[in-house]
């Protein structure tokens, strides 16, 4: 565990004659604040992915009013450091985004207005416990100077904050098998220390800070007995004693989300959905008001001028969450109709339509028959994004261009014989049947019966024909 610290030294116009005008004016006094977002440096995540290592907002800087006619100087800065605590090991290589925001303090209706003045980004290698690293970056017409470092929180030490140190118990040397803790020679490398609170009876660790459970126990600190009555959880190795699957610690076990946040597992880790007033990887940042600019991705903040009154973020399309921090999977709503393929481009949603369909959501069934003639008197029938011809007697094929054998479908019932004829077909009926298709039986007295039962009804079914 440890803290990443960022110190902003100056923010002002870059060199050269094209220096920008001050972002504040006598009519619109303003003040600056900064936001930092950290990600593990070698992660393959998209640019808009969350700040997996953490994020922080600075306090507001002093109010600044432009002096008319004077060039914009370096602008007054907030006091103090921006601090981003990290709970696990420091990754060594990290990516950062630092944003400079302007808060206008004029007579805006609905409170102050914010606008992004500059954004810089980079990927750096940084060992925890090392000296401050300095940087100078240009962003548009502005120049930002800053320093940063990562430091471990005791008892963690080392370049990744994974080694643990304790004060010496004896003045002369460390215990058996334990080395002095460079650079803190008066301290000793501690024996492996499991996660704080890890049950000494039911838990153990192979890495500092972890807590692995013995069979039959679960929870982040291995204090929860596994229920043997309902063996529902498929996580972890099988228990020989119970025959049940013993759950290994899942990312949401013990709910890592603070302040009433709800935890949901993700393929790699977990995600906290924070209640209003809290945010951060584990909902650990609190006392937030609109003055802290808590709405990400262009969300509009409304409400809360003091920490006791909550704020609401109105998110732009494509984002959700109490701080607009989550990108909406808008394709999960299946907006594309008629089998269209959904593409979420971030700024817009696109549907790639199947043949025969069009429109923003593939909602329009194209006139399949437009310009599609069916030959030889056939009629066009629309359907399913493709056209079909219903052909006149004696013709077949997709466009009714093929001369059909009218007798191929054996149209003459009850053993009647079929003859092809220029006008269609003729049935020569077997004795006892009559009709164009030999479909009616002839009664011995010469009267014809009602039509035979339609397909699907067996003779003798109690079916009356009227």
């Amino acid at each position: 565990a440890g803290v990443f610290e960022l110190q902003i030294h100056s923010f002002g116009p870059g060199p050269g004659p094209g220096a920008p005008r001050s972002p504040c004016s006598a009519r619109l006094p303003c003040r600056l604040f900064f936001r930092v977002c950290l990600k593990p440096g070698l992660s393959e995540e998209a640019a808009e992915s969350p700040c997996a290592l953490g994020a922080a907002l600075s306090a507001r800087g002093p109010v600044y009013t432009e002096q008319p006619g004077a060039p914009a100087p370096d602008l007054p800065l907030p006091d103090g450091l921006l601090q981003v605590p990290f709970r696990d090991a420091w990754p060594g290589t990290f990516s950062f985004i630092i944003e400079t925001w302007r808060e206008e303090l004029g007579d805006q209706i609905g409170g102050p207005a914010w606008s992004l003045l500059a954004r810089v980004a980079g990927r750096r290698r940084l060992a925890a416990g090392g000296p401050w690293a300095r940087d100078i970056q240009r962003a548009g017409a502005w120049e930002l100077r800053f320093s940063y470092r990562a430091r471990c929180e005791p008892p963690a030490v080392g370049t990744a904050c994974t080694r643990l140190c304790r004060p010496r118990s004896a003045p002369s040397r460390c215990g058996p098998g334990l080395r002095p803790c460079a650079p803190l020679e008066d301290e000793c490398e501690a024996p492996l220390v499991c996660r704080a609170g890890c049950s000494p009876e039911h838990g153990f660790c192979e890495q500092p800070g972890e807590c692995r459970c013995l069979e039959g126990w679960t929870g982040p600190l291995c204090t929860v007995p596994v229920s043997t009555s309902s063996c529902l959880s498929p996580r972890g190795p099988s228990s020989a004693t119970t025959g049940c699957l013993v759950p290994g610690p899942g990312p949401c076990d013990g709910n890592p989300c603070a302040n009433g946040g709800s935890c949901s597992e993700t393929p790699r880790s977990f995600e906290c959905t924070c209640p209003r007033g809290f945010y951060g990887l584990r909902c650990e940042v609190s006392g937030v008001t609109c003055a802290d600019g808590p709405c990400f991705n262009g969300g509009l903040c409304v409400g809360g001028a003091d920490p006791d009154s909550a704020y609401i973020c109105h998110c732009p399309p494509g984002f959700q969450g109490s701080n607009c921090e989550k990108r909406v999977d808008r394709c999960s709503l299946q907006p594309c109709r008629n089998g269209g393929l959904c593409l979420d481009l971030g700024h817009a949603l696109r549907c790639r339509c199947r043949a025969g369909f069009a429109g923003p959501r593939c909602e329009h069934d194209l006139d399949d028959c437009a310009g599609r003639a069916c030959a030889n008197g056939g009629t066009c029938v629309e359907g399913g994004g493709a056209h079909r011809c219903s052909c006149a007697l004696g013709f077949g094929g997709r466009d009714c261009r093929e001369r059909a054998d009218p007798c191929a479908a054996r149209p003459c019932a009850h053993g009647g014989r079929c003859y092809a004829h220029f006008s269609g077909l003729v049935c020569a009926c077997a004795p006892g049947y009559m009709g164009a298709r030999c479909e009616f039986p002839v009664h011995p007295d010469g009267a014809s019966a009602l039509p035979a039962a339609p397909p699907g009804l067996r003779p003798g079914d109690p079916q009356r024909y009227l």
């Epitope: 998209a46 980079g122 300095r134 940087d135 100078i136």
Partner: antibody, heavy 117, light 107 residues
Framework: QVQLVQSGAEVKKPGASVKVSCKAS????????IHWIRQAPGQGLEWMGY????????EFNHNFKDRVTMTRDTSTSTVYMELSSLRSEDTAVYYC??????????WGQGTTVTVSS | AIQLTQSPSSLSASVGDRVTITCRAS??????LAWYQQKPGKAPKLLIY???SLEDGVPSRFSGSGSGTDFTLTISSLQPEDFATYFC?????????FGGGTKLEIK
């Protein structure tokens, strides 16, 4: 106006060292870093490293890490780049440039270093 | 190190033409891309930084665009003094790296 003036051309033998100077003027010397970039004949540009004149902190491209040294003299606003264990492939034009981490806004005129036995 | 691929490697054009040079990064570099112009026997000169910011004193016919992995340098109307070699440079990661260059010649 901002100017970076470099020392003259050098001819060196393989295994020797070369020290190139870059004198800055027209701005506050400690306000910006000085980077070194080289360009082999007919080739592209290769960043070697930089020095922060305020803190004397240096960072190098790992390709040069064990052979390059950068120093500065604030009294004369001059930065020095020394490259040791020279080989024929170090024959190049060496440039100093003022800047930060994401811009090199003013460049020296270049110093030609020829390594030949 | 991040690789930058410039295209085309050489280009013939006439005065007054609109010319576009592209630079593709091997991974996302956000907007940390600069463009430099170099004439024979001279040091490179900064034209554009942070993808689209025009350096002081550079004519407005030069413009830059793009973010992430794909970037473009456009010269809206070529002037005789624009015939040179152009390099892109990423500054997202250390070490900064340069593209292979695009040589712009008179047709």
């Amino acid at each position: 106006q901002v100017q970076l003036v470099q020392s003259g051309a050098e001819v060196k033998k393989p295994g020797a060292s070369v020290k190139v100077s870059c004198k800055a003027s027209g701005y506050t010397f400690t306000r910006y870093w000085i980077h070194w970039i080289r360009q082999a004949p007919g080739q592209g540009l290769e960043w070697m490293g930089y020095i922060n004149p305020t803190t004397v902190y240096t960072e190098f491209n790992h390709n040069f890490k064990d052979r390059v040294t950068m120093t500065r003299d604030t009294s004369t606003s001059t930065v020095y780049m020394e490259l040791s264990s020279l080989r024929s492939e170090d024959t190049a034009v060496y440039y100093c440039a003022r800047g930060g981490s994401n811009f090199f806004d003013y460049w020296g005129q270049g110093t030609t270093v020829t390594v030949s036995s | 190190a991040i690789q930058l691929t410039q295209s085309p490697s050489s280009l013939s054009a006439s005065v007054g033409d609109r010319v576009t040079i592209t630079c593709r990064a091997s991974e996302n570099i956000y907007y940390n891309l600069a463009w430099y112009q170099q004439k024979p026997g001279k040091a490179p000169k900064l034209l554009i930084y942070t993808a689209n910011s025009l350096e002081d004193g550079v004519p407005s016919r030069f413009s830059g665009s793009g973010s992430g992995t794909d970037f473009t340098l456009t010269i809206s109307s070529l002037q005789p003094e624009d015939f040179a070699t152009y390099f892109c440079k990423q500054a997202y990661d250390v070490p900064p790296t340069f593209g292979g260059g695009t040589k712009l010649e008179i047709k």
